[in-house]
């Protein structure tokens, strides 16, 4: 529950549409855990691609592309009875507006692929 | 490349630490694609847990927890020679500060689990 139960939630309609944001990030070191190699060891491996946009904060976002159409089995062969699919997440970024050197930003939603997982098809069909 | 090459990048040291942010979200409908059922169909299925915090924007974030230690095989049995692991991503959220009804927020990093994938162990050992 909120520390101030009377405060409007930032998602409420009556909440101010423009707020002040401090860019000194808290929890800056959440990424201190070693970089995972799951992208290589997964049965649905992926490559990471750098998406860079200087008008955005953060300016660099890494996105996943599935390497295979099917999934890698225990023998290292691709099984096309299964599908490698991207796991997507909606994230919030700050977009500089109105596109000149101001300190004004707007929240923007981005749908990013974070990694891949192996799923069973639900439709059986003959190729 | 930036539309204004002379503009400081928001990650530069000389960029103002406090900026104005418009909360009217652009690209609000990136999630218009149908909700995916991969969490159930994956060989490393997961459950989604609601993480709610009214002092944060967005106040609701869904987090994945892998259902199994191993991965589900073609027969629906759990294979413990493989591991279900969470795919994690660092996201930015806005944290209300200094924790009373102000329009001031601070960027905060959160490490969230978005889904699970099935990986091969790198250490083989006998139990």
């Amino acid at each position: 529950s909120p520390q101030n139960p009377g405060c409007p939630n930032a998602e409420d309609k009556n909440f101010p549409r423009t707020v002040m944001v401090n860019l000194n990030i808290r929890n800056r070191n959440t990424n201190s855990k070693r970089a995972s190699d799951y992208y290589n060891r997964s049965s649905s491996p992926w490559n990471l691609h750098r998406n860079e946009d200087p008008e955005r904060y953060p300016s660099v976002i890494w996105e996943a592309k599935c390497r295979h159409l099917g999934c890698v089995d225990a023998d290292g062969n691709v099984d096309y009875h299964m599908n490698s699919v991207p796991i997507q997440q909606e994230i919030l970024v700050l977009r500089r507006e109105p596109r000149h050197c101001t300190n004004s930003f707007r929240l923007e939603k981005m749908l990013v692929s974070v990694g891949c997982t192996c799923v069973t098809p639900i439709v059986r069909h003959v190729a | 490349s930036p539309q204004n090459p002379g503009c400081p990048n928001a990650e530069d040291k000389n960029f103002p630490r406090t900026v104005m942010v418009n909360l009217n979200i652009r690209n609000r409908n990136t999630n218009s694609k149908r909700a995916s059922d991969y969490y159930n169909r994956s060989s490393s299925p997961w459950n989604l847990h609601r993480n709610e915090d009214p002092e944060r924007y967005p106040s609701v974030i869904w987090e994945a927890k892998c259902r199994h230690l191993g991965c589900v095989d073609a027969d629906g049995n759990v294979d413990y020679h493989m591991n279900s692991v969470p795919i994690q991503q660092e996201i930015l959220v806005l944290r209300r500060e200094p924790r009373h009804c102000t329009n001031s927020f601070r960027l905060e990093k959160m490490l969230v689990s978005v889904g699970c994938t099935c990986v091969t162990p790198i250490v083989r050992h006998v139990a």
Epitope: K65, C66, H68, P86, P121 | -
Partner: nanobody
Framework: EVQLVESGGGVVQPGGSLRLSCADS????????MGWFRQAPGKEREFVAA????????YYADSVKGRFAISRDTARNTVYLQMNSLKPEDTAVYYC??????????????????WGQGTQVTVSS
């Protein structure tokens, strides 16, 4: 609505070659697997070949295996279908699609979308 644009079709003799292109001018599908399909008069659209988002993996219908090769150029946002040793039964309108769903296996036509107008391939002597 975003659409893919196919080109490169034409009339060719049996045993000849053609290279089809599928352009994604908006860069909308650089993270999607892509597929080529074909539709002959009076028949349903059928799967020909597919390629993964990274280009590392390809899959072919049995009828074209060893003769056709799918590839993608990420810099140009284009997917290609190199067709060799063409046969009269390859005559059809060829379409490319972006894989947007995963209800079926890789050759399931309904999992693909954003078709273009297609490009006609005619194999005839």
């Amino acid at each position: 609505e975003v659409q893919l644009v196919e080109s490169g079709g034409g009339v060719v003799q049996p045993g000849g070659s053609l290279r089809l292109s599928c352009a994604d001018s908006e860069r909308s599908f650089s993270f999607n697997a892509m597929g080529w399909f074909r539709q002959a008069p009076g028949k349903e659209r059928e799967f020909v070949a597919a390629i993964s988002a990274t280009g590392d993996d390809t899959y072919y219908a049995d009828s074209v295996k060893g003769r056709f090769a799918i590839s993608r150029d990420t810099a140009r946002n284009t997917v290609y279908l190199q067709m060799n040793s063409l046969k009269p039964e390859d005559t059809a309108v060829y379409y490319c699609g972006a894989r947007v769903n995963f209800d079926g296996t890789v050759s399931y036509t309904n999992d693909y979308a954003y078709w273009g107008q297609g490009t006609q391939v005619t194999v005839s002597s």
